[in-house]
Every structure is written in structure tokens, then in C-alpha cells.
């Protein structure tokens, strides 16, 4: 969840006090403290919405809030891929789209979000209580996961609102570039603040909220995002998981049922690890298949950002899973 | 190093069935699904289906639905393709692949004649 | 079914010599959502399987030499080998990567002179 660190309305300085100076050395530690916060910490949201005219039917759509290219996204249902879940689509940005049934169609709607529109019937429909997953795999954040699913009460038509992350997992949260940067720009912001510490204070009103208390608690977990980190995963309700998972693609109109590849499980007890190999806790950053997502040992695609700097263990490679499957 | 090591050419009759395989190694299995693609002689590729090796999913073109049933053995990494009631317009060259076809096997080649 | 219409279906060229190979597929392979095209190129030798070159129309995959370029968009696509090889005699196909079932076109043979 975004932790939005809580900025002081600081009076603007008295003329002669600190002059314009003085005005950018308060501003700019906050600036920075609110980048500290909230950087590294994107967000993903899901959204399931039953069709009035299909009551087998549901629509999931699932975006990401970060600043970082995604490099793959999977969508999962019956709960996080690796716990448990069933893959029913991989996307890949450019590589393509993997769809198994009950999925119908898979299709990105902006560069951050997609939509998946599931239908069947009998035991390879979803229902109600199902719970879905997407996992985002972005450079440089990591891999984050949210999982959503319709309130018992929804009436069809309604969608639930977009859940953020209920379960997020940031397999990394945040890779050396951006978090380069970003150590820069907090080790100098405790530099100032050290600084200022040192100087007579300036002239606040009195009522203001020092900069040690924003501070605290700007680094303190919201309890929103703690309670997130201790949800546990939903229960399953097995009869909606499918019980075929054979499809075949029509002549007709271009079909998008296909398999997909899964992914690496997620460990229920620890950040999931994007590949299967076995990597240090919380540095499983997926390599896609080539591309963005430096697969194992392989470059990165000319056009993406290099991700030849946080290797995966398996070589170049390791990214390409699901599409691969993972 | 990512391997996919395909079973020998096939000689066999009309009517009858052939199952090939396509061993995989240098990376987890079921981390990845596995395509099947024929290729005619002297024709261009077809894509056949996938399957994804964690639950056995699969997926078809529509063209050969009825001709092959794809399955994965998961203890030895190996991914099957059976086609039946076999024809001469089933002679050809069948590869696996995996997801997204940047890994190819080496191709089987299966002769069907009386 | 997306029909991929591959042209020529071969020409001669001297080593050093830039070669264009053209790709049209019978509906667009954009994706209006994230506005990528989903184009596979792939080279054939003789007696080997396929390689793939190039993914999302432009991308090239790790280890092709930067004298393969893929360019298009929507339903006509370009490879372009800036300075041919004698090793870059072969086979080269399209593949539609955006809807299934996949589907390729029928080939490009190069030869060199």
C-alpha cells in the first residue's frame, strides 16, 4: 500500500529570516522524505465485476501504480499462483498474451493495466467467492501481487470496488538504479535534517508539528499496509477451479484461449520467488523471457531497460516464464 | 543450459498412432509452457498447441484437435505429443518449443507410409 | 485465422548487400493497449530448427547480431539485414504472436550469390 508520508504546511520564512535559501532547505527534505517513502512502494489493484447478462461471466481487471516498465503480468485464480491458484493468463508486453480456459479473453487496456474476461459453464466456470490474483513483474520495483474477489452480497452488474493489494508482495522492492538514487537522495536528506537539527530552528508557528514527529511517522507502516502484509491468503472454494483445462482455438475470429504458462508458486511463507531456482529471500526479480525481463544469463532486449545488473541465478532466461509458466 | 531433446524419426503405417517426446533440461520444467509445431516438407510451420507442464492444461489449434492429445510426464521433464489415425498429410517434421518459441528441439521427424 | 503473406518468396544477394524482407499480416497484430505489435521473425537453416530473431515487431532476442532489424507496425512488418552474411542464408517466417492459434507465413528463402 502507498504510504503517503505527512507533509507539514510549513510557514512560508519571514524576509531576512532564511530568504529563498532557507525556503528550499526547509522544502526539500520533505520533498525527499516523501519520495523515500512512498518510492519503491507501487501499488496494484484488482477489480472483479460479474456481467448482468452472464451470471458465469466475470470480468477482472487488474492495473499497476508504479513508475517502473512491467514486464510481465499473471493472472491467477483460487489464489496466488503459487499458493494454490491456477494460471489462467500470462501477459507479456511483448512477447504476447497466454490464455487457458476458463479464460476468454486476455488483453492489455493501458501500458500498466489489463483486463481478462472469464466465462464457462458447469465446473470449469468461476464463482462468486472465487478469489483472483495479479501479479505485476516490473523493473525496477520487483514483483507485486494483489488478489480481489466479488463481496458475497454483489449483486450482478456491480463490480467490487479495486482492491489494493490485499496481498502484496514485493519480491524486490526496488533495484539498485532507482534505489541508487534513492539511498543518495535519503542519506542527504538525513544530512540536512541533521544540519537543521544544528541551526537555530526556524520561525514555525508554534502549533506545527515539529520534523521529528512527520518523520516517525512518515517511516512508520500505515496500519492499513500492516494489516495487508498479515492477510492471509483467502480460502478456496475448489468446486469453482476448473475441471478441464483443455481448449482448443477456433478458425473463426481470432481466439484468445490458450495456455498459459504458470508461475514460479508462491511460497505461502515468504515473498514468492519469480523463479524456481532458489534465490535469497525478497531478491526473486522475475526475468521475463529476454526483452525487459533479462531471462537467465541472457541479455536484455535492446530496446528495455538492462536488466543484466540484477541477474536471475538461472541466466537470461529466467524471465521468460509465462509466458514461460511462471 | 536450456535443452529439449526430442525422441528419434518414426516410421509408421496409416491408421495407426505415434507418440513422440521432447526431454527438457537447464531449467525447471514446469516453469514454463511447451509448444508443438509441424513442419511439412518443404511447407511452413504450423502451430499445433501448448501445454502447461504445472497442471497438464492444454491448448489446441482447432485444426488439429482429434489429431493430438499433448501431455507431460513432470518426474522427467519430458512433454509428449501422440497423433493418431495417421494419414501421409501427417508426414513431417514435428518440434517442440518452448513458450514464447525461443527454445526449439532439435525436431522429430515422423514418415507415414504403407 | 490471421493469414501471414510473406514476399518474395526468395531472392539472390551478394555478401554485404542490404536485404528487406516484408511481412503483411490480414488483420493488425497492434496492441491497441499497451501499443505493441505482436510479431515474431525467425531464421531457418537447412536441417535445423527455427531461431527466433525478433519479438514485439523490433526487439531483438539476446545473441542475434545487430545487423538483423525488425520495423512495422499494424499489419506490415519489415526485416532488414543491413550487411548479409554468407551464414545468413536460410529460411526467414513471420509469425503472428497476437491471437491464436499462432500462425506463420510461408517463408522467405535467401540465398547467396
Known amino acids: 500500500m502507498r504510504t503517503e508520508a505527512q507533509v507539514p504546511a510549513l510557514q512560508p520564512p519571514e524576509p531576512g529570516l532564511e530568504g529563498a535559501m532557507g525556503h528550499r532547505t526547509l522544502v526539500l527534505p520533505w520533498v525527499l522524505l516523501t519520495l523515500c517513502v512512498t518510492a519503491g512502494t507501487p501499488e496494484v489493484w484488482v477489480q472483479v465485476r460479474m456481467e448482468a447478462t452472464e451470471l458465469s461471466s466475470f470480468t477482472i481487471r487488474c492495473g499497476f501504480l508504479g513508475s517502473g516498465s512491467i514486464s510481465l503480468v499473471t493472472v491467477s485464480w483460487g489464489g496466488p499462483n503459487g499458493a494454490g491458484g491456477t494460471t489462467l493468463a500470462v501477459l507479456h508486453p511483448e512477447r504476447g498474451i497466454r490464455q487457458w480456459a476458463p479464460a476468454r479473453q486476455a488483453r492489455w487496456e493501458t501500458q500498466s493495466s489489463i483486463s481478462l474476461i472469464l466465462e464457462g459453464s458447469g465446473a470449469s466456470s468461476p464463482c462468486a467467492n472465487t478469489t483472483f490474483c495479479c501479479k505485476f513483474a516490473s523493473f525496477p520495483e520487483g514483483s507485486w501481487e494483489a488478489c480481489g474477489s466479488l463481496p458475497p452480497s454483489s449483486d450482478p452488474g456491480l463490480s467490487a470496488p479495486p482492491t489494493p493489494a490485499p496481498i502484496l508482495r514485493a519480491d524486490l522492492a526496488g533495484i539498485l538504479g532507482v534505489s541508487g538514487v534513492l539511498l543518495f537522495g535519503c542519506v542527504y536528506l538525513l544530512h540536512l535534517l541533521r544540519r537543521h537539527k544544528h541551526r537555530p530552528a526556524p520561525r514555525l508557528q508554534p502549533s506545527r508539528t515539529s520534523p521529528q514527529a512527520p518523520r516517525a511517522r512518515a517511516w512508520a507502516p500505515s496500519q492499513a499496509s500492516q494489516a495487508a502484509l498479515h492477510v492471509p491468503y483467502a480460502t478456496i472454494n475448489t468446486s469453482c477451479r476448473p475441471a478441464t483445462l483443455d481448449t482448443a482455438h477456433p478458425h473463426g475470429g481470432p481466439s484468445w484461449w490458450a495456455s498459459l504458462p504458470t508461475h514460479a508458486a508462491h511460497r505461502p511463507q515468504g515473498p514468492a520467488a519469480w523463479a524456481s531456482t532458489p534465490i535469497p529471500a525478497r531478491g526473486s526479480f522475475v526475468s521475463v523471457e529476454n526483452g525487459l525481463y533479462a531471462q537467465a544469463g541472457e541479455r536484455p532486449p535492446h530496446t528495455g531497460p538492462g536488466l543484466t545488473l540484477f541477474p536471475d541465478p538461472r541466466g537470461p532466461r529466467a524471465m521468460e516464464g509465462p509466458l514461460g509458466v511462471r | 543450459e536450456v535443452q529439449l531433446q526430442q525422441s528419434g524419426p518414426e516410421l509408421v503405417k496409416p491408421g495407426a498412432s505415434v507418440k513422440i517426446s521432447c526431454k527438457a533440461s537447464?531449467?525447471?520444467?514446469?516453469?514454463?509452457?511447451m509448444n508443438w509445431v509441424k513442419q511439412s516438407h518443404g511447407k511452413s510451420l504450423e502451430w499445433i498447441g501448448d501445454?502447461?507442464?504445472?497442471?497438464?492444461?492444454?491448448s489446441y489449434n482447432q485444426k488439429f484437435k482429434g489429431k493430438a492429445t499433448l501431455t507431460v510426464d513432470k518426474s522427467s521433464s519430458t512433454a509428449y505429443m501422440e497423433l493418431r489415425s495417421l494419414t501421409s498429410e501427417d508426414s513431417a517434421v514435428y518440434y517442440c518449443?518452448?513458450?514464447?518459441?525461443?527454445?526449439w528441439g532439435q525436431g522429430t521427424l515422423v514418415t507415414v507410409s504403407a | 485465422d490471421i493469414v501471414m503473406t510473406q514476399s518474395p518468396s526468395s531472392l539472390s544477394v551478394s555478401a554485404g548487400e542490404k536485404v528487406t524482407l516484408s511481412c503483411k499480416s490480414s488483420?493488425?497484430?497492434?496492441?491497441?493497449?499497451?501499443?505493441?505489435?505482436?510479431l515474431a521473425w525467425y531464421q531457418q537453416k537447412p536441417g535445423q530448427p527455427p531461431k527466433l530473431l525478433i519479438y514485439?515487431?523490433?526487439t531483438r532476442e539476446s545473441g542475434v547480431p545487430d545487423r538483423f532489424t525488425g520495423s512495422g507496425s499494424g499489419t506490415d512488418f519489415t526485416l532488414t539485414i543491413s550487411s548479409v552474411q554468407a551464414e545468413d542464408l536460410a529460411l526467414y517466417y513471420c509469425?503472428?504472436?497476437?491471437?491464436?492459434?499462432?500462425?506463420f507465413g510461408s517463408g522467405t528463402k535467401l540465398d547467396i550469390k
Open positions: 518449443a518452448r513458450v514464447w518459441f525461443a527454445y
Open positions: 537447464g531449467y525447471t520444467f514446469t516453469d514454463y509452457s
Open positions: 501445454i502447461n507442464p504445472n497442471n497438464g492444461g492444454t
Open positions: 488483420q493488425s497484430l497492434l496492441n491497441s493497449g499497451n501499443q505493441k505489435n505482436y
Open positions: 514485439g515487431a523490433s
Open positions: 509469425q503472428n504472436a497476437h491471437s491464436y492459434p499462432f500462425t
